[in-house]
């Protein structure tokens, strides 16, 4: 409960706001989950609280778990959690899923894309941006404060873009970066009953105990912009939010992205720490919208390690 | 102890205005949230909205935005909730309460607002 | 906007007896709600926040429980001076009350 997602890159910088509203006057004691070790608050550590914000600077692979927020006011103690996960830089340009955040959608008329998360950084414009790796240039681009501008939008905008901006902490600074997939409405759209891309129906995917998993849905619905169109995971036929366990969590926004011109949508499970009993749990990647209901369903499995003599 | 003091009943004509008053004691009203609930006779209690007196943020309930305005005067303690355009349904008890972001701790004593021609 | 369902609107029970009065929302919330005592002429007193963390100075018979869509709130052992109305608060996403249960001593 009240516990919110946060990821990032390792050697970046990571801030991460706790996920229970308050004054800024409040108090907020951090804590590592796992250990109810106190997380300190002098400047001189790598991670450190400052107030609402828990500051990784930089952060560090091993920095993933859940984190204990307790916000104090006058009246009343406020518990939240902070679900960290820190990936390792990817060699290549492509963006996983799990990495993204929310789609944004333009039109002619409106085709800012703002930078994710960065009202949380001390940071100073210019905003680098990136499409699919690709630094920006041209007139039509226009990096204005948090957001950019794309002039006269064209189908072919359609991808991911990618912020990167500097983080300064007491004359120290770091490297941000945040991805999201841009999505341009197109007036000639069309709607199908849905098809799920992933996972295969009646998968199994091998995983390590104790390791972190991610399991993607992703399914398309037709072309163009879709009026509803949802996907989401269940556990044993229940709603995610139904199932008290903090270390498996859907990511909250969902993420479009357009394939072949088909409205495709993604939503990433995160499964931290993976338990024996996770084996046992069904997992139902649901694909929604006004034709009706598809199903797929995954199963975990340990990974077989072969010995060689 | 906190104590929040309220006005005085007060009676009043439709289409007129009230604001009515709540004072804190042994408290500064700048560390917490201030909200407000009307309690018509007889009837449940209807939060109406919320102010952060330490910098003037304001949140109103659908019902009655655009008739109430939250106030907050840090330097007496004392928060202010003003109702216009009043009719006959507003006749009601309004309460001020102190807490959270979400919820309320204290409550003052609340006021009667007779709305009447 | 979240809409609350408080049941029952009344109930009539004997001293002793074990009380249990229900909310349900009309969407997922977190544990964001809250319940409040009121006698009459009174102001609301809250008894338990959070969906089950006992204010200080609240007695032990007073509970509560539930997540998502339905809350749960008990009196274990009713006693003379639990004569009152409750209501639930949610507040996810502003603050809304349920619509009230008065429980009078049968």
């Known amino acids: 409960k009240f516990s919110k997602q946060s990821w990032g890159l390792e050697n970046e910088a990571l801030i991460v706001r706790c996920p229970r509203q308050g004054k800024s006057s409040y108090i907020v004691d951090w804590y590592y989950s796992q250990t109810n070790k106190s997380i300190p608050t002098q400047e001189r550590n790598r991670v450190f609280a400052s107030g609402q914000l828990l500051k990784f600077l930089p952060a560090e692979v091993a920095d993933s778990g859940i984190y204990t927020c307790i916000v104090r006011s006058p009246t009343f103690n406020r518990t939240g959690y902070a679900n960290v996960t820190i990936y390792k830089k990817q060699p290549d340009c492509n963006v996983p899923d799990y990495l993204m955040y929310s789609t944004v959608s333009g039109s002619e008329k409106n085709s800012k894309i703002y930078c994710p998360t960065i009202d949380l950084y001390n940071w100073t414009a210019p905003l680098e941006w990136f499409k699919n790796c690709q630094a920006l240039q041209g007139s039509r681009y226009k990096a204005h404060k948090s957001f950019l501008v794309i002039d006269n939008v064209m189908t072919d905008d359609a991808g991911d873009y990618t912020c990167k901006f500097i983080h300064n902490e007491n004359g120290a600074n770091y490297s941000v970066t945040a991805t999201r997939s841009f999505t341009v409405k197109d007036e000639q759209g069309f709607s199908l009953f849905p098809v799920i891309r992933a996972p295969a129906h009646n998968e199994t995917k091998e995983v390590e105990i104790g390791e972190n998993t991610n399991l993607t849905c992703s399914a398309c619905f037709g072309k163009g912009a879709q009026f509803l169109a949802t996907v989401q995971w269940q556990l044993n036929g229940n709603k995610i939010t139904d199932f008290s366990e903090p270390r498996i969590q859907q990511e909250e926004g969902q993420n479009q992205s357009f394939s072949n011109g088909l409205a495709c949508v993604n939503t990433v499970l995160r499964i931290a720490d993976v338990k024996e009993e996770d084996l046992l749990l069904r997992y139902d990647c649901l694909a929604l919208n006004l034709h009706g209901l598809r199903r797929h369903t995954i199963r975990l499995s340990r990974k077989h390690h072969h010995h060689h003599h | 102890e906190v104590q929040l003091v309220q006005s005085g009943a007060e009676v009043k004509k439709p289409g007129a205005t009230v604001k009515i008053s709540c004072k804190v004691s042994?408290?500064?009203?700048?560390?917490?949230?201030m909200h407000w609930v009307q309690q018509a006779p007889g009837k449940g209690l209807e939060w109406m909205g919320r102010?952060?007196?330490?910098?003037?943020?304001?949140e109103y309930a659908e019902k009655f935005q655009g008739r109430v305005t939250i106030t907050a005067d840090t330097s007496t303690d004392t928060a202010y909730m003003e109702l216009s355009s009043l009719r006959s349904e507003d006749t009601a008890v309004y309460y001020c309460?102190?807490?959270?972001?979400?919820?309320?701790?204290?409550w003052g004593q609340g006021t009667l607002v007779t709305v009447s021609s | 906007d979240i809409q609350m369902t408080q049941s029952p609107s009344s109930l009539s029970a004997s001293v002793g007896d074990r009380v249990t009065i229900t909310c349900i929302t009309n969407t997922d919330i977190d544990d964001v709600i809250h319940w409040y005592q009121q006698k009459p002429g009174k102001a609301p007193k809250l008894l338990i926040y959070?969906?089950?963390t006992l204010r200080p100075g609240v007695p032990s018979r007073f509970s509560g429980s539930g997540s998502g869509t339905d809350f749960t709130f008990t009196i274990s052992s009713l006693q003379p001076e639990d004569i009152a109305t409750y209501y639930c608060l949610q507040s996810d996403n502003m603050l809304t009350f349920g619509q009230g249960t008065k429980l009078e001593i049968k």
């Open positions: 102010i952060d007196p330490a910098i003037g943020n304001t």
């Open positions: 309460a102190t807490g959270d972001f979400y919820a309320m701790a204290y």
């Open positions: 959070e969906g089950n």
């Open positions: 042994a408290f500064n009203i700048k560390d917490d949230y």
